[in-house]
Amino acid sequence: EPPTACREKQYLINSQCCSLCQPGQKLVSDCTEFTETECLPCGESEFLDTWNRETRCHQHKYCDPNLGLRVQQKGTSETDTICTCEEGLHCTSESCESCVPHRSCLPGFGVKQIATGVSDTICEPCPVGFFSNVSSAFEKCRPWTSCETKDLVVQQAGTNKTDVVCGPQDRQR
């Protein structure tokens, strides 16, 4: 009686159970009554990560430098390559298939959260009493200089982009 189901790591073909190929190998020919399943190792830059009956191995993921990607972990015959963003770049999507430079916060805005490999810079407007006069992916809004603590007075009010200008107090004779 021919089998209707096979054991783990086997597959049914021509009414008989053949061994699957192990991870890292592809199927060349099915087994017969007289011969075992024939498997061959995947080539360079190819992989198969499961017991299988695939006749072609999968290509390793391509970490395209023109998309800002680099190899984080080199693939093997049993594992895929893992890509990550180059320094100073972050992913454009959850699956991280391309990367772009971190955004800078413009003058008048400061960095609320510094970018990571998976998230962009988060900027916030500088509130009253704070300023930023640079375009930066790292700098937070800075507080206006306190003229009083220097025994000076405000000569020019600060804005979200400029610091206050302090000057000497007018001395009344």
Epitope: P65, T92, S98, V100
Partner: antibody
């Protein structure tokens, strides 16, 4: 399925401008850059520039700088290539292509631009 | 710009023949070399990327090799449906540049 659908054929006079559109579907438009390539009749392929819809980053081939403008409308997942000050040598098929998981992995069907007086 | 020179510019071969197309870059492109197939009246299609990686769905009779400045596309056994123009393209340095193409015909 990733698809790039381009606008129809155009006939223009020398000195005019042309704007070719490329509507993307089947993937998240802002994930990958769009490349623009042209092919003059019976000739090879020539890269014009690329545009990343995520951050509007644009790179141009020096040969076309000042004449070509690449833009996109994220709300409609459409990329645009505008070429100004047209001359007869600009008669060509203009292609958009996605630089996706692989280089130039999906192409539009091409837009024929004829420049003739 | 990096110049890409293909040879031959055209060739005629018989079904079943082994066909090779060469591509030379004017400077080292570190394997950043792609091959495209353009059938008459059709859109170019990526065949091979990063010198030797076969795009999924492309018949295994196509292969690529090379390094430095010299690269080769090989068709191990030519089929009638392989009639097309083949282009190499360097992906190493902007502006991306293509070879002038090799037109392949069946004898």
């Amino acid at each position: 399925e990733v698809q790039l659908v381009q606008s129809g054929a155009e006939v223009k006079k020398p000195g005019a401008s042309v704007k070719v559109s490329c509507k993307a579907s089947g993937y998240t438009f802002t994930t990958f850059p769009i490349e623009w390539v042209r092919q003059a009749p019976g000739q090879g392929l020539e890269w014009m520039g690329n545009f990343h819809p995520y951050n509007d980053d644009t790179k141009y081939n020096e040969k076309f700088k000042g004449r070509v403008t690449l833009t996109a409308d994220k709300s409609t997942s459409t990329a645009y290539m505008e070429l100004s000050r047209l001359r007869s040598e600009d008669t060509a098929v203009y292609y958009c292509a996605r630089r996706g998981k692989l280089p130039f992995d999906s192409w539009g069907q091409g837009t024929t631009v004829t420049v003739s007086s | 710009d990096i110049q890409m020179t293909q040879s031959p510019s055209s060739l005629s071969a018989s079904v079943g023949d082994r066909v090779t197309i060469s591509c030379r870059a004017s400077q080292d492109i570190s394997n950043y070399l792609n091959w495209y197939q353009q059938k008459p009246g059709k859109v170019p299609k990526l065949l091979i990327y990063f010198t030797s990686r076969l795009r999924s769905g492309v018949p295994s009779r196509f292969s690529g090799s090379g390094s430095g400045t010299d690269y080769t596309l090989t068709i191990s056994s030519l089929q009638p449906e392989d009639v097309a123009t083949y282009y190499c393209q360097q992906d190493r340095k902007l502006p991306w540049t293509f070879g002038q193409g090799t037109k392949l015909e069946i004898k």
